[in-house]
Interface confidence: medium
Amino acid sequence: TQHGIRLPLRSGLGGAPLGLRLPRETDEEPEEPGRRGSFVEMVDNLRGKSGQGYYVEMTVGSPPQTLNILVDTGSSNFAVGAAPHPFLHRYYQRQLSSTYRDLRKGVYVPYTQGKWEGELGTDLVSIPHGPNVTVRANIAAITESDKFFINGSNWEGILGLAYAEIARPDDSLEPFFDSLVKQTHVPNLFSLQLCGAGFPLNQSEVLASVGGSMIIGGIDHSLYTGSLWYTPIRREWYYEVIIVRVEINGQDLKMDCKEYNYDKSIVDSGTTNLRLPKKVFEAAVKSIKAASSTEKFPDGFWLGEQLVCWQAGTTPWNIFPVISLYLMGEVTNQSFRITILPQQYLRPVEDVATSQDDCYKFAISQSSTGTVMGAVIMEGFYVVFDRARKRIGFAVSACHVHDEFRTAAVEGPFVTLDMEDCGYNIPQTDESTLMT
């Protein structure tokens, strides 16, 4: 996963028009694993911002060493800084932990840009603002890294919450969440509410502000409005889902739906942007440009290289379109859509020239590894990673940034046929080609 800016075809849309709604089978929400309702001790346990990642406080070792850990649903290793580094205020000191066990094995993780490497071991781990449990978990002690830690981000490690299949060095290294579920009575589910500020935060504001919530083992109903809609997890490696249709301001992009998932579509809290396959990105930008044509923006803006600034408080949100992603539903031939606002896909950044301006970066970018629904998507929604039932739920987040005219939305059901054909089957090779 990259933090910062990363970390035979058929349409599948034949048949009934998408606007035709299917009757709900029931008005009751499906039964959820875990406690329902309130998880007061876990609400507001995240800090950070989309550009640098959201982190949770964890303790490692005996006596406990407190570290801030990036929450990353796009990887599967629990890895922490374990040696001095210019960007780290603190790091895991294995020699000070009486419960540390060395696995006598190294791990090397290259990213598209940058890398980290370290030594594997196990130790006791807990989450102070999480379930009241301690688990023995695998830990990669990062001894060397390049372009991994972010100056000023305030996190010292990464909590990979995806599945064992993409763990490094191989799938035999049990991820943290698997260990947690195995060793405790915590239900096999977690949910994330990432709260974008809607304006740039300086270092002290990030430290003082609430960034959101990671509810471990359940769903907190105070964190969302409306209903939760679930999409199947296609395969348990990344949190892979299937997008069946894309609309810009209600206008269908009209692409073969396989293109939307080429070569996969994942939900990744460790990536800043909404990342789209090349063809889809080009079509989406063309459509967004057309919708916002009352202003002409530089090419550099659409490439994410250039800021656009407005005088404070005058951002013309109304000229930018909403973006809807239709996701495969749980019922045959049924989909639902999630809709984000420009308040999600225009990311506020500090303008180094003046504080009189509100400056933004376009936070949709091109990908060569499929669609990545990163923080800019997740900031609109409460997202439930229901591992027990192999599905991901979306509801409108109680903390999403919007204006008086438009709000993010999760709506359904819609009739969509042949959705299975929207998934891309990655050719299997003997050697892993994974480049997170």
Epitope: G300, L307, C359, K361
Partner: nanobody, 128 residues
């Protein structure tokens, strides 16, 4: 609607000076980043001096560094280009430009494709 109107062009002997002005109107609710481009006969339009950097620094083409100075008067919505020690190769139509965005990474937004609005241009002719 945003409009840019240049003035101050004309003919001058090599070594002489000219001051171009560009008045911007219609910027109702936001600020733009201003600059000057030029286009000589048979050549592509090129950036001369742009204030498109978020840091407020001005980019100058190598060929005009030390001779041309761009300044901006925000109160009057006017941008100026003071051109000294003019050379025959400075002969061109000079265009005022406004960009919607600024470059945050320190590199200049100095390509005509990045410009949101153009003036109609003013002719500068330098004879030897």
């Amino acid at each position: 609607d945003v409009q840019l109107q240049e003035s101050g062009g004309g003919s001058v002997q090599a070594g002489g000076s000219l001051r171009l002005s560009c008045v911007a109107s219609g910027f109702t609710y936001r600020r733009y980043f201003m600059g000057w481009f030029r286009q000589a006969p048979g050549k592509e339009r090129e950036a001369v001096a742009t204030m498109f950097s978020c840091g407020g620094t001005t980019y100058y083409a190598d060929s005009v560094k030390g001779r041309f100075t761009a300044t901006q008067d925000n109160a009057k919505n006017t941008v100026y280009l003071q051109m000294n020690n003019l050379k025959p190769e400075d002969t061109a139509i000079y265009y005022c430009a406004a960009a919607s965005g600024c470059w945050y990474d320190g590199s200049p937004a100095a390509r005509s494709v990045d410009v949101s609005f153009w003036g109609h241009g003013t002719q500068v002719t330098v004879s030897s």
